[in-house]
Amino acid sequence: EPPTACREKQYLINSQCCSLCQPGQKLVSDCTEFTETECLPCGESEFLDTWNRETHCHQHKYCDPNLGLRVQQKGTSETDTICTCEEGWHCTSEACESCVLHRSCSPGFGVKQIATGVSDTICEPCPVGFFSNVSSAFEKCHPWTSCETKDLVVQQAGTNKTDVVCGPQDRLRHHHHHH
């Protein structure tokens, strides 16, 4: 009765358990009773990342600069190339097949987390006491200017999009204050 199963680094073919090819190599010929499995290394731009019985190696991924992609890690005979996005762009998926421009945070919003090659900018609304008057992919919400520390008074209240406007203290009120 021929075998119906094989060990993990083997595969069943013609009632034989043959050795799988190691990562980085492809199958050239199956084993026989008297000859071992024949494997050959993958070519320059090819890889296989598992113990396998593949007759063709996989092509390394191409990081297309026209799609905003660049090589993050060069592929080997055992690993695929890893692509990432050019500065200012991020991947649209985990496989990083294309890139999109980092989102900017509108006025009234600040950057909570700066974008990376794989994640977009995360914005947050500026809370009371903070503002952002620019559209930016880097700027956080800034605190309102403290007029008091400059010995000035608030002439115009701040908003989430504008800073407070400080002005000189009223001379008369200032004078009475000291009497």
């Epitope: 199963a5 060990r7 993990e8 358990c17 009773e33 008297f34 494997c39």
Partner: antibody, heavy 127, light 107 residues
Framework: EVQLLESGGGLVRPGGSLRLSCAAS????????MNWVRQAPGKGLEWVSY????????DYADSVKGRFTVSRDNSKNLLYLQMNSLRAEDTAVYYC????????????????????WGQGTMVTVSS | DIQLTQSPSSLTASVGDRVTITCRSS??????LAWYQQKPGKPPKLLIY???SLLGGVPSRFSGSGSGTDFTLTISSLQPEDFATYYC?????????FGQGTKLEIK
């Protein structure tokens, strides 16, 4: 230290059942294929069963097929052999043994061997 | 199933002797063969895998050779601790099988 320790052996009547356990220490058994091998008193070694590292593939000697079931609990580092419909000829010392794949990337195909064995547990089937 | 036949079944030799044990397979198994040493009351101990590769820690007086159907285990110069029973095992396909054993006794 890498060790395997069998337990669960004993005296059982013909037709009875027994469950053997094999506890692994010093290594992660979930990364290895495992076997049960037995040895009747004064006799040679007889391979009994095999289980793959995740437990999805099993195989058995013809003499125990349909009566014995091998299983594993990788979260507890345990290997089991459920033995049903026991016969007098199942009387033996039962060893659990680790399958290891020896591989040198500069070499060719690699090779298997059983490099770690437990001390064994005695199973006696008698009326 | 693949049958393994060891010869001789028993062997008497002296310390310092060169000893050869053979293992013949009923069908070709390439180099999927291991050799074990077993002493009374103890579990087997792996010596050689892949027909000819010596396990780390095993003395270099042990060597294995062969491929296909004919295999040999050689002990170049017997030491007192080498007197034991030796088994070959095929790991080519299931069911895995062992030879019947060769008992090496002191003369």
């Amino acid at each position: 230290e890498v060790q395997l320790l069998e337990s669960g052996g004993g005296l059982v009547r013909p037709g009875g059942s027994l469950r053997l356990s094999c506890a692994a220490s010093g290594f992660t058994p979930g990364s290895y294929e495992m076997n049960w091998v037995r040895q009747a008193p004064g006799k040679g070694l007889e391979w009994v069963s095999y289980i793959s590292s995740a437990g999805e593939t099993t195989d058995y000697a013809d003499s125990v097929k349909g009566r014995f079931t091998v299983s594993r609990d990788n979260s507890k580092n345990l290997l089991y052999l459920q033995m049903n419909s026991l016969r007098a000829e199942d009387t033996a010392v039962y060893y659990c043994a680790r399958d290891v794949f020896f591989f040198d990337s500069s070499g060719d195909n690699g090779a298997y061997g059983m490099d770690v064995w437990g001390q064994g547990t005695m199973v006696t089937v008698s009326s | 199933d693949i049958q393994l036949t060891q010869s001789p079944s028993s062997l008497t030799a002296s310390v310092g002797d060169r000893v050869t044990i053979t293992c013949r397979s009923s069908q070709g198994i390439r180099s999927s063969l291991a050799w074990y040493q077993q002493k009374p009351g103890k579990p087997p101990k792996l010596l050689i895998y892949g027909a000819s590769s010596l396990l780390g820690g095993v003395p270099s007086r042990f060597s294995g050779s062969g491929s296909g159907t004919d295999f040999t285990l050689t002990i170049s110069s017997l030491q007192p601790e080498d007197f034991a029973t030796y088994y070959c095992q095929q790991l080519n396909s299931f069911p895995s099988t062992f030879g019947q054993g060769t008992k090496l006794e002191i003369k």
